[in-house]
């Protein structure tokens, strides 16, 4: 069906590259006639080392191609990226990262762990992918709520905790002042919003210690904070209602059993914080001496009734609310509390499900004399501010 | 036509960040090719520096491998050339080039100094 | 990586003549090698890919040839206005690399 131009000439046979083929198949291409070449999957076109993504010759006058054969070679996903806190293994065979080739990204274990199974596979777009088709890495997260701690203890009315108790407590130092935090994160710190209300503009000031037991120790681990986030509904100076804060690290901290975020309150958790039910806060705070104390101390206590607690302040410090985002807890025979220096610490509860621990509370206010008969410690209900938490740690 | 055009912030402190764009005008960078960042020092040499491809792979330079991102943003028909902690030796010409150099930009001019 | 080298920093021609530059590559890259030419004060432009293969709009007088590690760029009947440094590329192995440069200045 070709008309030979006298001036043209054919031009040779097109070979179709090894794992690829030419379109159209034709006896004689003379000008102005075009192919192209076509890879098979999980091969890409290059030419040289540059990828095309389509590939077409035309037959010139001179009866040469106006441009050379490409190959078809065999798709490279390259080497996968690193996993912090975790390692890749190679499955199909070492550093093998070609087509249909497979690895296995696993967390270092007992600290961290993944959604997926982590298995990925080099798929015909070049990209290492799951099972369930994502083509980001996975995310080691930190493993939370793992103690050596078991309740029964008998701060004040407290005993000492031992390594590993309490792996989620933070020191947090001001120039003049102390307070406490629980990570919830690798990078973030919860704590009470009065106790960094001053920090809040110049968050750098505040020096953050974790992995610690004794208060003085030169042996922790220092986190700087990033920024301070206060929750919007407190009013510094006027209650404590919304009485919460999140820090945000600037890097995250490597998790091992001195440093271990706490759990976050599932919904289910409401119902192991009822009346009588017992948590657990420590603290580097005054003690029954009136002294801070040297060592991390924490005491078991039960959760009171709500209306019993607003009762007690509405006699003692007229004015002063107990708002339905506070939990109370403490003895009506005093004795155990929390106190001045413990502000923002964890008050903790064991999950019998998950066998984790979580935060329940966080230390907010109470009676000046703490540990005092019918004067509960109060804590803010972490339970209602989940949404909030959410919100700020996937939005910063 | 193809155009390609870099545009960058000219000067940059030492341990800063670099970020440069190259805008693509008379083809869509989705629809084949790689696009590649190449810069030219003072004394004419010139580094490839690594490139980004038509379904967003990226390939780079070993020797700046650490410091390097090459990213895209394909409703703006634009890819952009990202690197850390810059020092004086970083000072060059930028060029945005497409496929083996087929079409070049006019190049972007960075210098690092404090 | 493969190294190419432009052994001749500068070369001198007169109008009308027939000049080649050479490029060596220190590995076999078969015929993935673009050659470009660079004004004062311009960005490159693509003058020759794939060895052999002329980039469109470029004059004929321009002529590529070489496979492996031995590449040559021919320019015949050399213009006033081919003053310029001519660079060739690697492609077919990455990291790509550029040869040093040749200057050519026309007498």
């Known amino acids: 069906h070709h008309h030979h131009h006298h001036a043209s000439r054919p031009c040779p046979d097109p070979t179709a590259p090894p794992n690829g083929s030419i379109s159209p198949v034709q006896a004689i291409y003379v000008l102005k006639d075009r192919f192209s070449v076509f890879c098979k999957t999980g091969f890409e076109l290059l030419q040289g080392s540059v990828p095309l993504k389509s590939f077409t010759a035309v037959c010139q006058k001179d009866g040469s191609w106006d441009r050379p054969m490409p190959e078809c070679s065999i798709i490279d996903c390259g080497p996968p990226d690193d996993l912090p806190n975790g390692h890749v293994d190679y499955i199909t065979g070492p550093e093998v990262t070609t087509y249909k080739a497979v690895i296995q990204y696993s967390c270092e274990e007992t600290f961290y762990t993944m959604s997926s199974n982590g298995k990925y596979v080099c798929e015909a777009d070049g990209f290492w992918t799951s099972s369930k088709g994502e083509k980001l890495p996975p995310v080691c997260e930190p493993v939370c709520g793992l103690s050596t701690h078991t309740i029964g203890g008998r701060i004040v009315g407290g005993q000492p905790a031992k390594p590993g108790d309490f792996p989620w407590q933070v020191l947090l130092l001001g120039q003049t002042t102390a307070a406490a935090g629980a990570l919830i994160h690798d990078n973030w710190v919860l704590t009470a919003a009065h106790a960094v209300y001053e920090k809040r503009m110049a968050a750098s000031s505040l020096n953050i210690r974790m992995g610690i037991l004794k208060r003085l120790s030169p042996h922790y681990t220092q986190a700087w904070p990033e920024e301070i986030f206060i929750h919007e509904g407190y009013t510094h100076g006027a209650g404590f209602d919304n009485d919460i804060a999140l820090i945000k690290l600037k890097n995250k901290v490597t998790i091992n059993g001195s440093i271990m975020p706490v759990c976050l309150p599932r919904k289910e958790a409401a119902s192991l914080m009822r009346t009588d039910f017992t948590g657990t806060v420590a603290g580097w705070g005054l003690t029954q001496k009136g002294l801070l104390a040297r060592n991390l101390m924490f005491v078991d206590i039960p959760i009171a009734d709500h209306q019993k607690c607003t009762a007690v302040y509405e006699k003692l410090y007229p004015g002063v609310r107990v708002s339905a985002n506070m939990l109370c807890a403490g003895l009506e025979t005093g004795g155990k509390d929390s106190c001045r220096g413990d502000a923002g610490g964890a008050l903790v509860f064991l999950d019998n499900e998950t066998q984790r621990w979580f935060v329940g509370g966080i230390v907010s206010w109470g009676s000046i004399n703490c540990g005092a008969a019918d004067q509960y410690g109060v804590y803010t209900k972490v339970i209602n501010y989940i949404p909030w938490i959410e919100n700020i740690i996937s939005n910063f | 036509d193809v155009q390609l055009q870099e545009s960058g912030p000219g000067l940059v402190k030492p341990s800063q960040s670099l970020s440069l764009t190259c805008t693509v005008t008379g083809y869509s960078i989705t629809s084949d090719y790689a696009w590649n960042w190449i810069r030219q020092f003072s004394g004419d040499k010139l580094e490839w520096m690594g490139y980004i491809s038509y379904s967003g792979s990226t390939s780079y330079n070993p020797s700046l491998k650490s410091r390097i991102s090459i990213t895209r943003d394909t409703s703006k028909n634009q890819f952009f050339l990202h690197l850390s902690s810059v020092t004086t030796e970083d000072t060059a010409t930028y060029f945005c080039a497409r496929y083996w150099g087929d079409y070049w930009g006019h190049g972007t001019t960075l210098t690092v100094s404090s | 990586d493969s190294v190419m080298t432009q052994s001749q920093k500068f070369m001198s021609t007169s109008v009308g003549d027939r000049v080649s530059v050479t490029c060596k590559a220190s590995?076999?890259?078969?015929?993935?090698v673009a050659w470009f030419q660079q004004k004062p004060g311009q960005s490159p432009k693509g003058l020759i890919y794939?060895?052999?293969y002329r980039s469109s709009g470029v004059p004929d007088r321009f002529t590529g040839s070489g496979s492996g590690t031995d590449f040559t760029l021919t320019i015949s009947n050399v213009q006033s206005e081919d003053l310029a440094e001519y660079f060739c590329l690697q492609y077919n192995s990455n990291p790509l690399t550029f040869g040093g440069g040749t200057k050519l200045e026309v007498k």
């Open positions: 794939s060895a052999s």
């Open positions: 590995h076999n890259v078969g015929t993935n």
